[in-house]
């Protein structure tokens, strides 16, 4: 089961865009949707790298606590090669169209691959989108 | 559940200043910028400025520079709106919003009526 | 600044009809957003990112647009429907201009 029982933690007022793929399949402006964040996960994400088997471009963004965002094996909850994380602190905040911008806030880590962080961002259900 | 509460329905002389409050639970200001919003009776919605919280940092509609002001106290989770040199034209219902970073208002307050009258 | 135009500003609809309404911006932005209100309460939260329904928003809902011009079309006209209706755009940098409104009255 999931590491946390997010359904039972109350919202807290937090908004981040959510979305897993890449830039044209899954994580294009289109495709991704803000959820409502819950419990400690207060700061908006985006992880990019490259995932396996044929190292193809990913990205993931979503909720995340704190330590998630300085997490330095957050690239094998999805497979991921060369992470590169971003986090940031404002309520839709890791929007697509930002990515290229300065985002307000943000603090960023890099990391080679790859601990069983997926269990987190599967339970993000991309169903809760606004 | 996330709110906004805002201070009550405020009656004040011509050329007097107001200073409105908006206060938020189940969330904290600093996550967002708190904007305030203008609607005169019967009128559409007015983008005034906003606040981030976080670090002071304020915008405002060229219209409303020197008429409004928005601060904010983190220690308390409020933000206010103060007006200055009241006419019958700020006579309106104001709406503090919470703003995500992409200008989406997705949490409003129920608005306070000011009311200017001599 | 940029001005937004909403028309019309007024129309009624029948239950069940397709109910269109458009936002015009007078130079290009990036989304553009939408509120519901009705008569003496708070705007609700309604569309955003130009396409995105909020929560709770019924699925007859939808937006579309781009550069200087935006829609809102409601499939299928229902009572609850009834509520004025404002355009609100994001570009880069504020300031955030609302449209005037277009108010929908149920026939």
């Known amino acids: 089961g999931p590491i946390l029982e997010l359904e039972n933690l109350p919202q807290n007022g937090r908004q981040c865009y959510s979305c897993k793929g890449n830039s044209t399949h899954g994580c294009s402006s289109e495709e991704t949707f803000l959820i409502d964040c819950r419990g400690p996960m207060n700061q908006c994400l985006v992880a990019t790298g490259t995932h396996e088997p044929k190292n193809q471009s990913y990205m993931v963004r979503g909720c995340a606590t704190a330590s998630m965002c300085q997490h330095a094996h957050l690239g094998d909850a999805f497979s991921m090669n060369h992470i590169d994380v971003s986090c940031c602190t404002k309520s839709g905040c890791n929007h697509p169209d930002l990515d290229v911008q300065y985002r307000g806030g943000s603090h960023h880590h890099h990391h080679h691959g790859g601990s069983g962080l997926n269990d987190i961002f599967e339970a993000q259900k991309i169903e809760w989108h606004e | 559940e996330v709110q906004l509460q805002q201070s009550g329905a405020e009656l004040v002389r011509p050329g007097a200043s107001v200073k409105l409050s908006c206060t938020a639970s189940g969330f904290n200001i600093k996550d967002e910028y708190i904007n305030w919003v203008k609607q005169r009776p019967e009128q559409g919605l007015e983008w005034i400025g906003w606040i981030d919280p976080e670090n002071g940092d304020t915008e405002y509609a060229s219209k409303f520079q020197g008429k409004a002001t928005i601060t904010a106290d983190t220690s308390s989770n409020t933000a206010y709106l103060q007006l200055s040199s009241l006419t019958s034209e700020d006579t309106a219902v104001y709406y503090c919003?919470?703003?995500?970073?992409?200008?989406?208002?997705?949490?409003w307050g129920q608005g306070t009526l000011v009311t200017v009258s001599a | 600044q940029i001005v937004l135009t909403q028309s019309p500003a007024i129309m009624s609809a029948s239950p069940g009809e397709k109910v269109t309404m458009t936002c015009s911006a007078s130079?290009?932005?990036?989304?553009m957003h939408w509120y519901q209100q009705k008569s003496g309460t708070s705007p609700k939260r309604w569309l955003y990112?130009?396409?995105k329904l909020a929560s709770g928003v019924p699925a007859r809902f939808s937006g579309s647009g781009s550069g200087t011009s935006y829609s809102l079309t409601i499939s299928s006209m229902e009572a609850e429907d009834a509520a004025t209706y404002y355009c609100q755009q994001w570009s880069s940098n504020p300031p955030y201009t609302f449209g005037g409104g277009t108010k929908l009255e149920i026939k």
């Open positions: 919003t919470g703003g995500n970073y992409v200008g989406w208002f997705p949490y």
């Open positions: 990112d130009t396409s």
């Open positions: 130079s290009s932005v990036s989304y």
